[in-house]
């Protein structure tokens, strides 16, 4: 028989960690592997067909993606959609094959709404997701004694798919879940110094723990303000999200581990203001499957799409579509042998979720709700040489932090500060409170 | 409540090998860092070596660096501590504890140590 | 390797007396340092960490203080169950080193 996977990705816009110039030799090695064992689908031929989810301009769009997507249903009737990975092209296309009762998978999509599973029918995540970054740094604050208060910052940038805003939304909304914590949240604009100002007046009353979320730059112009402001000293902790590690790696922006070089005058107050802040990226696997991989993955996309493929942790992503696409057929096979047939949507999907699966990006948990269990590494500034480096790892599938280092994280008062400042965020509490006066009794 | 066992100790002539375990309880085990710290009869205290909880990073003191090697099974939550070519000044209480990276406590918890004694 | 100095090596003090040891770091340790105390044929226990703070279980009798290359151990009112041997840790750097200890008994 012919099963028909539909692929609803950027097809020319190379920039996206979904691009197909990215995930089109992922999928050729898991369909490659596929034909080699004898045990995953016999006799079966696997095809691909594709739909771009973007726009004339190269851009993800809500318009173009489920339009191809309706287009490839009527053309191929496919078993499978693989896709889309940008959370407003994914919306309307999940919402479609829900109806339609076809398997949505993809490795991208990682806002939180594509966790409400009654609107996303059939919608299996084999990559990261936003929800499970809450996961994480509740783990981390209930270790850290820090159950009271955090502040979290976005910045939003014009055409860049309100990515921080998805990030914090998913981070936000599951830390309040876990934790009986009040949490605030503000969004700025990154291209305009006003609200980095406005932010910096508003944060000694919001947090002391504050995670944002933004471009590296943004981050360090934030962290040159702030230690200008008197606000990176012991009493304060600055957690970048960023996810993919852009801040930590070479080539054309700064320097590999020293997200606050720059070479342009302020990298002695950046590395001063760094001392304060923490980084949180998605986990790199470090299992050798990953690294072969990695060297197929970039010869095929070479040899194949003529695209270079650089080093970092958006490779987790094709990885991840490989990984899945491999659950996704193993998955099918079993239906097969129970007799079930490839358009089962319903049944295969249930085989892949709550599932564990071993693959190129090492130990997999799908939870019961199709979405994959997520590792983070949370990196820190060795005080010696300024580099950062990983200190600690959350394996999201055991929800346990793993230390990394069997060094102590850089407090700049030998400990981690306080959620909630000694008196109070406005000096409330009564015990600070100078004017005792006395009472004649 | 946090327990470490130590144990494994024992007489040993010069030149000969041992190898002690901590058996960890009451604390999630990969998420410290952990460490054999030793003490001579009568004498202070020495930090001999540490290990991450992913067991990626090991650091050692020089006096028995190339000679023991540190280990940790997270599965078992077990620490160890194998010590090859055994030396008269190795002879000492060896104690395991926990190293917390994430707060600052140091050595927070301790075994109750175990003996080693290198002796012809 | 970072040196710890210990003062003094012993002293005996009555109860009720305020007792103050220090240590000195041969190198800058900002405030990467550990008090233990350890009672003849126990284990060791934490008595101070990050220079100056007291982790829970810890009587408030005992403080730390200090920064950089100088820290001080106090004892504001001794007592009995104080005797003891007090070491100070540099954890600022591998390899970690001990004071050589602080023998502390009662007149």
């Known amino acids: 028989g012919n099963l028909t996977v539909a692929v609803v990705l950027p097809l020319a816009n190379t920039s996206y960690p979904w691009s197909w110039a990215r995930v089109g030799p992922a999928v050729e090695l898991a369909l490659a592997q596929v034909k080699a064992r004898p045990d995953l689908l016999p006799g079966w031929t696997v095809r691909t067909v594709l739909g771009s989810s973007e726009n004339a301009l190269g851009v993800c769009s809500d318009t173009a993606a489920p339009l191809a997507a309706v287009d490839l249903k009527w053309e191929h009737n496919p078993a499978v959609f693989l896709g889309p990975g940008c959370v407003y092209a994914a919306a309307p296309v999940g919402r479609f094959t829900a109806h339609w009762r076809v398997p949505l998978l993809t490795a991208g999509a990682p806002a939180l709404g594509f966790g409400v599973k009654d609107e996303y029918a059939l919608t299996t995540r084999a990559g990261p997701s936003y929800a499970k970054l809450g996961d994480f740094v509740a783990a981390l604050h209930r270790r850290l004694g820090w159950e009271r208060q955090a502040l979290m910052l976005y910045a939003y940038r014009p055409g860049d798919e309100e990515h921080c805003f998805f990030l914090v939304e998913g981070l936000f909304m599951r830390v309040r879940d876990r934790l009986n914590i009040t949490v605030d949240h503000l969004e700025f604009a990154e291209d305009d110094l006003s609200h980095y100002t406005r932010l910096l007046r508003t944060m000694p009353r919001k947090g002391r723990v504050i995670y944002i979320c933004s471009s590296p730059d943004a981050f360090r112009t934030l962290m040159l303000l702030a230690l200008e402001a008197g606000l990176c000293g012991e009493d304060y902790v600055f957690f970048h999200l960023d996810i993919f590690g852009q801040s930590l790696q070479g080539g054309q922006g700064p320097a590999p581990r020293r997200p606050w070089e720059r070479g342009d005058g302020q990298d002695v107050s950046a590395r001063q203001a760094f001392q304060a802040a923490k980084i949180i990226t998605y986990k790199d696997p470090d299992n050798p499957e990953y690294l072969e991989f990695l060297k197929q993955l970039k010869h095929l996309a070479y040899e194949q799409f003529n695209f270079t493929m650089e080093d970092g942790l958006v490779n987790t992503i094709p990885a991840s579509f490989h990984d899945g696409l491999l659950l996704y057929i193993q998955a099918v096979t079993e239906t097969l042998a129970h007799g079930g047939t490839v358009t089962d949507g319903e049944n295969i999907t249930q085989r892949m979720w709550n599932r564990s699966f071993q693959g190129v990006t090492g130990y997999l948990k799908i939870d019961s709700s199709g979405d994959r269990e997520t590792d983070f590494s949370l990196w820190d500034m060795d005080p010696e040489n300024g580099a950062f480096r990983v200190v600690l790892n959350y394996n999201g599938t055991s929800q346990e932090l793993v230390a990394v280092s069997g060094r102590k994280l850089n407090w700049p008062l030998g400990y981690p500060p306080p959620d909630i400042p000694k008196c109070g965020f406005d000096n409330e509490d009564p015990a600070c409170n100078q004017d005792h006066l006395s009472t004649l009794e | 409540e946090v327990q470490l066992v130590e144990s494994g100790g024992g007489l040993v002539q010069p030149g000969g090998s041992l190898r002690l375990s901590c058996a960890a309880s009451g604390f999630t085990f990969s998420s410290y860092a952990m460490s054999w710290v030793r003490q001579a009869p009568g004498k202070g205290l020495e930090w001999v070596s540490t290990?991450?909880?992913?067991?990626?990073?090991?650091y050692y003191a020089d006096s028995v660096k190339g000679r023991f090697t540190i280990s940790n099974d997270n599965s078992k939550n077990t620490l160890y501590l194998q010590m090859n070519s055994l030396r008269a000044e190795d002879t000492a209480v060896y104690y395991c504890a926990n190293y917390d990276i994430l707060t600052g406590h140091s050595f927070e918890y301790w075994g109750q140590g175990t003996l080693v004694t290198v002796s012809s | 390797a970072i040196q710890m100095t210990q003062s003094p090596s012993s002293l005996s003090a009555s109860v009720g007396d305020r007792v103050t040891i220090t240590c000195r770091a041969s190198?800058?340790?900002?405030?990467?340092l550990g008090w233990y105390q350890q009672k003849p044929g126990k284990a060791p226990e934490l008595l101070i960490y990050?220079?100056?703070r007291l982790p829970s279980g810890v009587p408030l009798r005992f403080s730390g203080s200090g920064s950089g290359t100088d820290f001080t151990l106090t004892i504001s009112s001794l007592q009995p169950e104080d005797v003891a041997t007090y070491y100070c840790?540099?954890?600022?750097?591998?390899?970690?080193?001990f004071g050589p200890g602080t023998k502390v008994d009662i007149k």
């Open positions: 290990i991450s909880g992913s067991g990626t990073n090991t």
């Open positions: 840790l540099q954890d600022y750097n591998y390899p970690f080193t």
């Open positions: 990050a220079a100056s």
């Open positions: 190198q800058g340790i900002r405030n990467d």
